[in-house]
């Protein structure tokens, strides 16, 4: 009887262990402002923190500026991007700005990139005001496969707010794929 | 044999009960507009509903204007803040507004406050238009410990939209800390 | 003894099966731009994709332009709505726009509609700029009962961005109702 019970317990222990090892993946990555590209055109942001302050990662990988999925599943993805300008930073090249974010998915198997979510606004940042600020938030629920990569593209990267509470993106697994 | 089976079933029953008691915490708090502070500078909003309309709370506590964590875990936090002004409400002091939200975390053990998320925009609300509106949304995934407190700070609180569908914040636990 | 063990295993198998059948519901619906209503007033958007590109649905139903809940629970709801205008599309009737989204819940039992979340902004889209863009994001945690329906209302539908990464809404179940 004990052997039988041990068998039952053991199988559940395996399940528990396996589910522990495969604990729900997540990531919250914050901007690394020491390496923000210049220019006003759309660029991919490759420098993010994954292990300081609010930044953290588990059962996902951060490599070459991309968040790599290690576990198939349905994930909630989100991004918060803040832009700002103070007159002491110098004059803007134009008052008419397109401040945008694009959250993209790349599959290595099929080397193609697709935009999952986009957001932003055209803004008129006139010289009459000494300070300008604007934030974008996007979020959505997506099926991600192991090996797929998530990256962030923005316009006007030189206007990004470098604070960890301002410019970040992340993901957490909600459920398995049936 | 029955005793053994009862033991196996019993231990799972305990686990089920315990997990039921420790059901995933959540909160969705909506603005209580009867007590909104004035001024244009950053203030902490302390009046929120937790048990009427869409507002609800479970396995978290609302006290002294702060959402208190009762269970360690990784939580998704979010806030939606709407600002509005109609000319019939009076004249604005300035057309150049900084409409901002800050979601902050306070630890009682280490009495310090840190901003987890911020969002907003500078806006030009001219007297030439009879109505103005603007909403901010922020969200992110954070590790929260029991006893930590979440609060909301905004600029220009007198411009807040008092509707429950407009100005609210919340949290729900996604997973345990390993 | 084997019979007892089979009984124990069987009951857990039932539980696993049942939980598999009742897998966490979700939906991510993207705008179907072939059928966007015109006008500038608030309208309900009824044409959404549920099974192409990023759009998907499981254990929820999409019918008559509404997302129908099949399983009681607490859900995270979200919407991302993008508006845009290029001068080549023609002249706007007014420069002063109210670009808004309303996420509403309808109960068939009590035929009434309530707004869960709203967001947006008043905008001044002047003819001095050839392109204008603006995105809204809202999200929140709500108790939904089987049979309740979620729908999306927007102002100025003719200005909607028809891309699947731009205009979408969704939901995923986070936990049961106690």
């Amino acid at each position: 009887i004990r052997a039988e019970k041990a068998m039952v317990d053991g199988s559940w222990l395996d399940l528990a262990k396996r589910s522990k090892l495969e604990a729900q993946p997540f990531a919250h990555l914050t901007i690394n402002a020491t390496d923000i590209p210049s220019g006003s055109h759309k660029v991919s942001l490759s420098s993010w923190y994954h292990d300081r302050g609010w930044a953290k990662i588990s059962n996902m990988t951060f490599s070459n500026g991309k968040l790599i999925v290690n576990q198939d599943g349905f994930y909630y993805l989100y991004a918060n991007i803040c832009f700002r300008h103070h007159e002491t930073s110098g004059d803007l090249a134009t008052e008419y700005l397109q401040l945008m974010v694009y959250v993209t998915k790349t599959s290595i198997k099929i080397p193609s990139s697709h935009t999952l979510m986009k957001g932003g606004s055209t803004k008129y940042w006139s010289g009459n005001s000494e300070f300008h600020f604007y934030s974008i938030n996007v979020g959505g629920f997506f099926k991600l496969r192991s090996g797929e990569e998530i990256s962030i593209e923005v316009s006007n990267p030189s206007l990004l707010d470098p604070d960890q509470d301002a410019t970040y993106f992340g993901a957490f697994k909600v459920r398995d794929i049936d | 044999i029955r005793a053994e089976k009862a033991m196996v079933d019993g231990s799972w029953l305990d686990l089920a009960k315990r997990s039921k008691l420790e059901a995933q915490p959540f909160a969705h708090l909506t603005i209580n507009a009867t007590d909104i502070p004035s001024g244009s500078h950053k203030v902490s909003l302390s009046s929120w509903y937790h048990d009427r309309g869409w507002a609800k709370i479970s396995n978290m506590t609302f006290s002294n204007g702060k959402l208190i964590v009762n269970q360690d875990g990784f939580y998704y936090l979010y806030a939606n803040i709407c600002f509005r002004h109609h000319e019939t409400s009076g004249d604005l002091a300035t057309e150049y507004l900084q409409l901002m939200v800050y979601v902050t975390k306070t630890s009682i053990k280490i009495p310090s406050s840190h901003t987890l998320m911020k969002g907003g925009s500078t806006k030009y609300w001219s007297g030439n238009s009879e109505f103005h509106f603007y909403s901010i949304n922020v969200g992110g995934f954070f590790k929260l410990r029991s006893g930590e407190e979440i609060s909301i700070e905004v600029s220009n609180p007198s411009l807040l939209d008092p509707d429950q569908d407009a100005t609210y914040f919340g949290a729900f636990k996604v997973r345990d800390i390993d | 003894i084997r019979a007892e063990k089979a009984m124990v295993d069987g009951s857990w198998l039932d539980l696993a099966k049942r939980s598999k059948l009742e897998a966490q519901p979700f939906a991510h619906l993207t705008i179907n731009a072939t059928d966007i209503p015109s006008g500038s007033h608030k309208v309900s958007l009824s044409s959404w994709y549920h099974d192409r590109g990023w759009a998907k649905i499981s254990n929820m139903t999409f019918s008559n332009g509404k997302l129908i809940v099949n399983q009681d629970g607490f859900y995270y709801l979200y919407a991302n709505i993008c508006f845009r205008h290029h001068e080549t599309s023609g002249d706007l009737a007014t420069e002063y726009l109210q670009l808004m989204v309303y996420v509403t819940k309808t109960s068939i039992k009590i035929p009434s509609s309530h707004t869960l979340m709203k967001g947006g902004s008043t905008k001044y889209w002047s003819g001095n700029s050839e392109f204008h863009f603006y995105s809204i994001n809202v999200g929140g945690f709500f108790k939904l009962r089987s049979g309740e329906e979620i729908s999306i209302e927007v102002s100025n539908p003719s200005l909607l961005d028809p891309d699947q990464d731009a205009t979408y809404f969704g939901a995923f179940k986070v936990r049961d109702i106690d």
């Epitope: - | 004035s38 001024g39 002091a93 150049y96 007297g127 | -």
Partner: nanobody, 126 residues
Framework: EVQLVESGGGLVQAGGSLRLSCAAA????????MGWFRQAPGKEREFVAG????????GYVDSVKDRFTISRDNTKNTVYLQMASLKPEDTAVYYC???????????????????WGQGTQVTVSS
């Protein structure tokens, strides 16, 4: 140091007009809310008119609505009060005041303004 200097006061007959000016110096004028107050003999100082930093929002005390107009020229660091259809009860010392926008709405009380001019006398004879 903030300096506010009023001018344009004087003696005028009932029904007449005057234009008061207030020249500002020593601060970023466009960042300040401006207001006009007045104090009649034996009475407390009262709010007359206020104007937002950009000049598109204006507010008035009921007794001067449709008769007085406040305006500003941020390029000249000056705020104006155009007074028409003047009445003997408009007789008072008129003060220019300035404040940073510490409230969302136009401040209307004396204590909400940080900086004051010396005042200019307006006398309306019947």
């Amino acid at each position: 140091e903030v300096q506010l200097v009023e001018s344009g006061g004087g003696l005028v007959q009932a029904g007449g007009s005057l234009r008061l000016s207030c020249a500002a110096a020593g601060y970023t004028f466009r960042a300040y809310v401006m207001g006009w107050f007045r104090q009649a003999p034996g009475k407390e100082r009262e709010f007359v008119a206020g104007i937002s930093t950009g000049g598109t929002w204006t507010g008035y005390v009921d007794s001067v609505k449709d008769r007085f107009t406040i305006s500003r020229d941020n390029t000249k660091n000056t705020v104006y009060l155009q007074m028409a259809s003047l009445k003997p009860e408009d007789t008072a010392v008129y003060y220019c005041a300035a404040t940073t926008p510490v409230t969302s709405y136009l401040p209307r009380s004396e204590r909400q303004y940080e900086h004051w001019g010396q005042g200019t006398q307006v006398t309306v004879s019947s």
